[in-house]
Interface confidence: medium
């Protein structure tokens, strides 16, 4: 850009792009300022005046530099079986996750609609596949030579201790009992745990300003004339009126 062109709005060089945190307004045919996170475009720029930004209202947010006419609504309040892991602020959406020991049993793009308690494997069964944010624990019978004596959503089957002389043979739900004071080999005392799933899924992630109308479209996919994220060149020749579609 020529050195004298420093302030928005300005006309870009032919074939040129707007600078960081600016966008090209199709109507004004000028490079104009974007609004920072937590704000939105209250008045769009003209050839002689720059974008006028305004703070997001309560329960709305913008996470990126943008030129959207309205801030995005924060997601629904978290349900009773969820915890709010991130509050709704002007710059970020609310994030709800299922409580520890629970997972999301039914979800839509808007987030988890119903949390369910992770299955507990009963004695004689161990965790074959641990639970995740969106899937239940899978239990399996303990194979010969292994056991689980707990009711747990994290314990796996453990090998029986090996005895010099066996007092009571182990089975799927009980360890072997040795007559000698020390077995030749044993697992460390206590159950072996699989880690609990760490729930990080956002209930609502930042959607595009022109929301998807396709049922299967991910909330994260840019649809329509989305403002480019911070750091892009802003060379998007979209007009702000498109946002009202």
């Amino acid at each position: 850009l020529p050195a004298q062109v420093a302030f928005t709005p300005y006309a870009p060089e032919p074939g040129g792009t707007c600078r960081l945190r600016e966008y090209y307004d199709q109507t004004a045919q000028m490079c104009c300022s974007k609004c920072p996170p937590g704000q939105h475009a209250k008045v769009f720029c003209t050839k002689t005046s720059d974008t006028v930004c305004d703070s997001c209202e309560d329960s709305t947010y913008t996470q990126l530099w943008n030129w959207v006419p309205e801030c995005l609504s924060c997601g629904s309040r978290c349900s009773s079986d969820q915890v709010e892991t991130q509050a709704c602020t002007r710059e970020q959406n609310r994030i709800c996750t299922c409580r520890p020991g629970w997972y999301c049993a039914l979800s839509k793009q808007e987030g988890c609609r119903l949390c369910a308690q992770l299955r507990k494997c009963r004695p004689g069964f161990g965790v074959a596949r641990p639970g995740t944010e969106t899937s239940d624990v899978v239990c399996k019978p303990c194979a010969p030579g292994t056991f689980s004596n707990t009711t747990s959503s994290t314990d796996i089957c453990r090998p029986h201790q090996i005895c010099h002389v066996v007092a009571i043979p182990g089975n799927a739900s009980m360890d072997a009992v040795c007559t000698s004071t020390s077995p030749t080999r044993s697992m460390a005392p206590g159950a072996v745990h699989l880690p609990q799933p760490v729930s990080t899924r956002s209930q609502h992630t930042q959607p595009t300003p022109a929301p998807s109308t396709a049922p299967g479209t991910s909330f994260l996919l840019p649809v329509g004339p989305s403002p480019p994220a911070e750091g892009s060149t802003g060379d998007h020749h979209h007009h702000h009126h498109h946002h009202h579609h």
Epitope: S76, D136, P211, S212
Partner: antibody, heavy 120, light 111 residues
């Protein structure tokens, strides 16, 4: 208390469009889904689709894609359904209903219905 | 799509007796111990009204003579005892997956 107030009866010509409205009150409009359901005279209920007004996200029954367009205006807490290229098959009563994001996952409050008659 | 088949299509019951309506799904509507099956009552000229949600939960304000049971593919709505105000059409509906679907309806009459 939760209320859904639907617009009045519509008489339309084949090939034209109508836009039905559903004004919500008594709860936070952007927190829950608005569903639309069709009922032809003497027939059962058919789910058209739903919109989440907080984001504008929509979910459609494949059968009604291209026929129904769901929108919502947060400022007036009103959901809309536009029916296009009307034929006699579209003559029916159309209901809007609220479905909470959490919990019941059922349509717990309904509008009174809007009758659409398509006739030349 | 999940197809819901209601039976019978119509039912005549004496006042004070029990009415039982069945709804069978073409595939399971269960997920993680929850059944996403609901029951609605529609009186002629009125919108449907939610009676039972998630198979067996009584909606607030609905009389206790209405109850729901079942799991996976087979569900039942029971009205016991039937009153004159219960003359209506009853629909089951699943919300396990899109598109949500309704049963064909069961018309309850008093004999």
């Amino acid at each position: 208390q939760v209320q859904l107030q639907q617009s009045g009866a519509e008489l339309a010509r084949p090939g034209t469009s109508v836009k039905l409205s559903c004004k919500a009150s008594g709860y936070t409009f952007t927190d829950d889904y608005i569903d639309w359901v069709k009922q032809r005279t003497g027939q059962g209920l058919e789910w058209i689709g739903e919109i989440y007004p907080g984001s504008g996200n929509t979910y459609y029954n494949e059968k009604f894609k291209g026929k129904a367009t769901l929108t919502a205006d947060k400022s007036s807490s009103t959901a809309y359904m536009q029916l296009s290229s009307l034929t006699s098959e579209d003559s029916a009563v159309y209901f809007c209903a609220r479905s909470q994001v959490y919990g019941k996952i059922a349509m717990d409050h309904w509008g009174q219905g809007t009758s659409v008659t398509v006739s030349s | 799509d999940i197809v819901l088949t209601q039976s019978p299509a119509s039912l005549a019951v004496s006042l004070g007796q029990r009415a039982t309506i069945s709804c069978r799904a073409s595939e399971s509507v269960d997920n993680s111990g929850n059944s996403f099956m609901h029951w609605y009552q529609q009186i002629p000229g009125q919108p449907p009204k939610l009676l039972i949600y998630r198979a067996s939960n009584l909606e607030s304000g609905i009389p206790a003579r209405f109850s729901g049971s079942g799991a996976r593919t087979d569900f039942t709505l029971t009205i016991d005892p039937v009153g004159a105000v219960d003359v209506a059409t009853y629909y089951c509906q699943q919300s396990k997956e899109d598109p949500y679907t309704f049963g064909g309806g069961t018309k309850l009459e008093i004999e």
